[in-house]
């Protein structure tokens, strides 16, 4: 292990579409992958008229977009489906939205997930 890196071994798991996908609805997911590759957690959600609806949470394969991110933060401006990834066990329990705007200051929209 590289000093200072949070190794991801498990992530919070949630699937709003669990019946169609034939998975569990919620739980803890152990993360698998090639032994030399990094592993991450992710969260995806929608903002329906100001109401946060979680789509999925789980493990994410080696991705340089996620390196050294201890917090799960979406930075894209108003995506159709919000996505964030992070490193560290269960780092996807909390996720937030900090859009990167060119002119105005970024606004913080922290999200506390409440799976149904």
């Amino acid at each position: 292990a590289i000093l200072g890196r949070s190794e991801t071994q498990e992530c919070l798991f949630f699937n709003a579409n669990w019946e169609k996908d034939r998975t569990n609805q919620t739980g803890v997911e152990p993360c698998y992958g090639d032994k030399d590759k990094r592993r991450h957690c992710f969260a995806t959600w929608k903002n329906i008229s100001g109401s946060i609806e979680i789509v999925k949470q789980g493990c994410w394969l080696d991705d340089i977009n996620c390196y050294d991110r201890t917090d799960c933060v979406e930075k894209k401006d108003s995506p159709e489906v919000y996505f964030c990834c992070c490193e560290g066990n269960m780092c996807n329990e909390k996720f937030s939205y900090f859009p990167e705007m060119e002119v105005t200051q970024p606004t913080s929209n922290p999200v506390t997930p409440k799976p149904p």
Epitope: Y32, D34, K37, F42, T44, V55, K56, G58, C59, W60, L61, D62, D63, I64, N65, K76, P79, E80, V81, Y82, F83
Partner: antibody
Framework: QVQLVQSGAEVKKPGASVKVSCKAS????????INWVRQAPGQGLEWMGT????????SYAQKFQGRVTMTRDTSISTAYMELSRLRSDDTAVYYC????????WGQGTLVTVSS | QSALTQPASVSGSPGQSITISCTGT?????????VNWYQQHPGKAPKLMIY???KRQSGVSNRFSGSKSGNTASLTISGLQAEDEADYYC???????????FGGGTKLTVL
């Protein structure tokens, strides 16, 4: 073991569209990206675009903007690449590959565009 | 993003070492550790050999190694064997904020 199995060869007329599928198994489909790459006969690899398999968000190479559409169906662990307004120079083998590092590849789908 | 530059061909005798270069710019190859190397035999799909400049993909022989200096990434194959004869492509990570690009490919001939 990780496998990406693509749909069979297609012959299309100029102006038509083609939709190639890529069925993933051996890993959690919604845990990475699917990239699409093509290779014209005797030529090199050309990146077409990528889809985030969990969120569905896409990024396309500028050359294919407006002609390519990448989608996925998470319930059957399958990604799709549709290319429209086909021309003869779209004749190529089309590959899907897993993840940002392209660590596993499909077997390829030959698309022939000919009048 | 413009294509990465590779030599069209290289050759070597069995047992020798060869190096294939992949040149980009200071804003891609030079500033990010995201270059990969792929091997492709005729009629087959490409195979990932090296990712992240210098990390060997699982199951790949340690005769294959990757490095980077400035804006140029390199693939070195030591102890050349007949089965190494193939086309080799460099390429970049693609996904999220990153767009993919490949080099033009290098044909390796084992003499």
């Amino acid at each position: 073991q990780v496998q990406l199995v693509q749909s069979g060869a297609e012959v299309k007329k100029p102006g038509a569209s083609v939709k190639v599928s890529c069925k993933a198994s051996g890993y959690t489909f919604t845990s990475s990206y699917i990239n699409w790459v093509r290779q014209a006969p005797g030529q090199g690899l050309e990146w077409m675009g990528t889809i985030n398999a969990v969120s569905g968000s896409t990024s396309y190479a500028q050359k294919f903007q407006g002609r390519v559409t990448m989608t996925r169906d998470t319930s059957i662990s399958t990604a799709y690449m549709e290319l429209s307004r086909l021309r003869s120079d779209d004749t190529a083998v089309y590959y899907c590959a897993r993840g940002g590092w392209f660590d596993y590849w499909g077997q390829g789908t030959l698309v022939t565009v000919s009048s | 993003q413009s294509a990465l530059t590779q030599p069209a061909s290289v050759s070597g005798s069995p047992g020798q070492s060869i190096t294939i270069s992949c040149t980009g710019t200071s804003s891609d190859v030079g500033s990010k550790n995201y270059v990969n190397w792929y091997q492709q035999h005729p009629g087959k799909a490409p195979k990932l050999m090296i990712y992240g400049v210098s990390k060997r993909q699982s199951g790949v022989s340690n005769r294959f190694s990757g490095s980077k200096s400035g804006n140029t990434a390199s693939l070195t194959i030591s102890g050349l064997q007949a089965e190494d004869e193939a086309d080799y492509y460099c390429g970049t990570f693609a996904g999220g904020d990153y767009y993919g690009v490949f080099g033009g490919g290098t044909k390796l001939t084992v003499l």
